[in-house]
């Protein structure tokens, strides 16, 4: 089996308040099966931003069509960015189970929010 890698190509992204932020994430293998989740921050205080298994997440849309059976692109777009959205975002693969368990994480993308242009 090819070892699954999670690629977050952007170390940082800067977005003006009120605009949308696109956070890129691709995986290199469909296995092991299990959902992709996005979090802001790390550790126990991290905040769930998107979970492939459940929804909806009103401000979050996937950039590609994740219902394709061979889809490996789990990039997301977050709309109407505010300063509260600043932080490091991690794309994480979970392995199926009861409960699902964290399998591998991307390196993270730091989102910074610029003041809305006047």
């Amino acid at each position: 089996e090819e070892e699954l890698q999670i690629i977050q190509p952007d170390k940082s992204v800067s977005v003006a308040a009120g605009e949308s932020a696109i956070l890129h994430c691709t995986i290199t293998s469909l296995f092991p099966v299990g959902p992709i989740q996005w979090f802001r921050g790390a550790g126990p205080a991290r905040v769930l931003i998107y979970n492939q298994r459940q929804g909806p997440f009103p401000r979050v849309t996937t950039v590609s069509e994740t219902t394709k059976r061979e889809n490996m692109d789990f990039s997301i777009s977050i709309s109407n960015i505010t300063p509260a959205d600043a932080g490091t975002y991690y794309c994480i693969k979970f392995r199926k189970g009861s409960p699902d368990t964290e399998f591998k994480s991307g390196a993270g993308t730091e989102l910074s929010v610029r003041a809305k242009p006047s």
Epitope: V33, R53, K68
Partner: antibody
Framework: DVQLVESGGGVVRPGESLRLSCAAS????????MSWVRQAPGKGLEWLAG????????YYIDSVKGRFTISRDNPKNSLYLQMSSLTAEDTAVYYC???????????WGLGTLVTVSS | ALTQPASVSANPGETVKITCSGG??????YAWYQQKSPGSAPVTVI????KRPSDIPSRFSGSASGSAATLIITGVRVEDEAVYYC???????????FGAGTTLTVL
């Protein structure tokens, strides 16, 4: 409530064609992958074909590839199965089903009966 | 191919377990579909190995480990009489498969 209603079944002769429809309501149709499953008399369930939410990607079981075509019209909330070169072995109840995030099925239609007989 | 027993019987109130084997835990998710009569609409009682739809009674549960999945009905009722199909999605082939079905008889 999620509702799936199939139509278009009937009696056809071997070699003829038929187009089945599935009208969806009670959910955002354009967000879900869909599938067709059939059940021959006295037999079990057999998955035939699936289609991604946007309709760009389709998947088939080998035995119907080239004869059956799955498609969808998202503005009309409708799923279709075009069947050609029908044989007696295609006699079955045909169900449309909504897919879960991981391509299992959570809701099923009531089915439409297709009988292929000379 | 997914393999499940042809039939299972139980008395009301007993716990029923129906097993399904043949998938690969690494690449397969399982579901269980209930069909009360031939040609009637199937009802999903479990999907994603162990997830129960909100309208399904809590006596239905599921699990998966290794190459097998199990449907458990705790405190089976007469109205649970049906054929139960194990279904799987294999991420290697992009194909859905079904077992041949297990007829549950409640005595």
């Amino acid at each position: 409530d999620v509702q799936l209603v199939e139509s278009g079944g009937g009696v056809v002769r071997p070699g003829e064609s038929l187009r089945l429809s599935c009208a969806a309501s009670g959910f955002t149709f354009s967000s879900y992958a869909m599938s067709w499953v059939r059940q021959a008399p006295g037999k079990g369930l057999e998955w035939l074909a699936g289609i991604s939410a946007g309709g760009s990607d389709t998947y088939y079981i080998d035995s119907v590839k080239g004869r059956f075509t799955i498609s969808r019209d998202n503005p009309k909330n409708s799923l279709y199965l075009q069947m050609s070169s029908l044989t007696a072995e295609d006699t079955a109840v045909y169900y449309c089903a909504r897919e879960t995030w991981n391509h299992l099925f959570d809701y099923w239609g009531l089915g439409t009966l297709v009988t292929v007989s000379s | 191919a997914l393999t499940q027993p042809a039939s299972v019987s139980a008395n009301p109130g007993e716990t029923v377990k129906i097993t399904c084997s043949g998938g690969d835990y690494y690449s397969t998710y399982y579901a269980w579909y209930q069909q009360k009569s031939p040609g009637s609409a199937p009802v999903t009682v479990i999907h994603s190995d162990d997830k129960r739809p909100s309208d399904i009674p809590s006596r239905f549960s599921g699990s998966a480990s290794g190459s097998a999945a199990t449907l458990i009905i705790t405190g089976v009722r007469v109205e649970d009489e049906a054929v139960y199909y194990c279904g799987g999605y294999d991420g290697r082939t992009y194909i859905n498969t079904f077992g041949a079905g297990t007829t549950l008889t409640v005595l």
